[in-house]
Amino acid sequence: ARNGDDCPLGPGRCCRLHTVRASLEDLGWADWVLSPREVQVTMCIGACPSQFRAANMHAQIKTSLHRLKPDTVPAPCCVPASYNPMVLIQKTDTGVSLQTYDDLLAKDCHCI
Amino acid sequence: ARNGDDCPLGPGRCCRLHTVRASLEDLGWADWVLSPREVQVTMCIGACPSQFRAANMHAQIKTSLHRLKPDTVPAPCCVPASYNPMVLIQKTDTGVSLQTYDDLLAKDCHCI
């Protein structure tokens, strides 16, 4: 798969990791999370042109069929390939607890 | 996550498994695959409205941020949650061999 700097649509337009700042209110977490009050959410955003960061054989098939039948088969989509864990200080009935989530922040991205 | 029949956009419009018939030529495989000559490709197609088949916490975050910043953050995307293996009879330098691929056909779908 081609690397993230080799985007045929122009620099930064293809599938890659982006950071979006979000408050607990933005995330709908204010009623059950105490900290952090703001999260630097890493997520996968960008286009998936032909064979760019193709995750697997399925992604390659999808690219081929999208080219043939664009109204029926969508292009591959930019999604997390792996995640970084994140700890939340959660409200409980009796106070607070620390909880680690393994599927919250994208670590790197691919097209599928 | 809600099941595939509970699509708020109407039956069959949300993220689910579809089958697309494709020839070796369609897939660009004719030069290296001998059989099958045609594949029933299963893939994940459809919309991912709020919390529909959300794969994990990241998908839930994405939904929340897409609602707030639709021009910056895309909606979750319908992708394979797991795969069915498939055997190909491949051409080799000396003849043919059987090769099983584990990441070729979608088995079920989720939104991420």
Epitope: - | S35, N84, V96, T100
Partner: antibody, heavy 118, light 107 residues
């Protein structure tokens, strides 16, 4: 590494039902394109295809024997079964199971000899 | 049913020779024909797929050819371990059928 092994009763009497089991490893019958077939060979004679079953549970039978044949599978235990009802001496043969990929027999078991005798 | 005819029941050859085993189909098979080798006391082994493609691990002295109704398995530089019976099989349509076999004898 693909291996297949047939097992059967060895000997049975005319009019009985022959039950054969093919136990295999090295592939899965949940794989698209994969199947298992049964072939028999009377001593000193040629090969006769009997039946096969595919990953999607499609079943095909030799039309000459169809009314007597039943093929089934247990995907999770890597086994395929063949039953032949109302056997007679003409069913005496070595019975093979074979891994199939898109209609050819890629790997064969060692075979099991079945004798029908009164 | 499709009949696969192997007209030569026996063929005699010497080590180092070249020999051709033929198979004729009763109707057009395109290239949907396979060849198998069965050594004495053993189970059959796949040699050729789709008329001309050697299966992995099969020595390159085995060559398949043909399409339509006429098919040939050629063994060049015959070796003593090639002593076996050779069967063709059609998988163009059900029921799958085999040729009656050709036994290769080494002089």
């Amino acid at each position: 590494q693909v291996t297949l092994k047939e097992s059967g009763p060895g000997i049975l009497q005319p009019s009985q039902t022959l039950s054969l089991t093919c136990s295999f490893s090295g592939f899965s019958l949940s794989t698209y394109g994969m199947g298992v077939g049964w072939i028999r060979q009377p001593s000193g004679k040629g090969l006769e295809w009997l039946a096969n079953i595919w990953w999607n549970d499609d079943k095909y039978y030799n039309s000459a024997l169809k009314s007597r044949l039943t093929i089934s599978k247990d995907t999770s235990n890597n086994q395929v079964f063949l039953k032949i009802s109302s056997v007679d001496t003409a069913d005496t043969a070595t019975y093979y199971c074979a891994q199939m990929a898109y209609s050819w027999f890629a790997y064969w078991g060692q075979g099991t000899l079945v004798t029908v005798s009164s | 049913d499709i009949v696969m005819t192997q007209s030569q029941k026996f063929m005699s050859t010497s080590v180092g020779d070249r020999v051709s085993v033929t198979c004729k189909a009763s109707q057009n098979m395109d290239t949907n024909v396979a060849w198998y080798q069965q050594k004495p006391g053993q189970s059959p082994k796949a040699l050729i797929y789709s008329a001309s493609y050697r299966y992995s691990g099969v020595p390159d002295r085995f060559t398949g050819s043909g399409s339509g109704t006429d098919f040939t398995l050629t063994i060049s530089n015959v070796q003593s371990e090639d002593l076996a019976e050779y069967f063709c099989q059609q998988y163009n349509s059900y029921p799958f059928t085999f040729g009656s076999g050709t036994k290769l004898e080494i002089k």
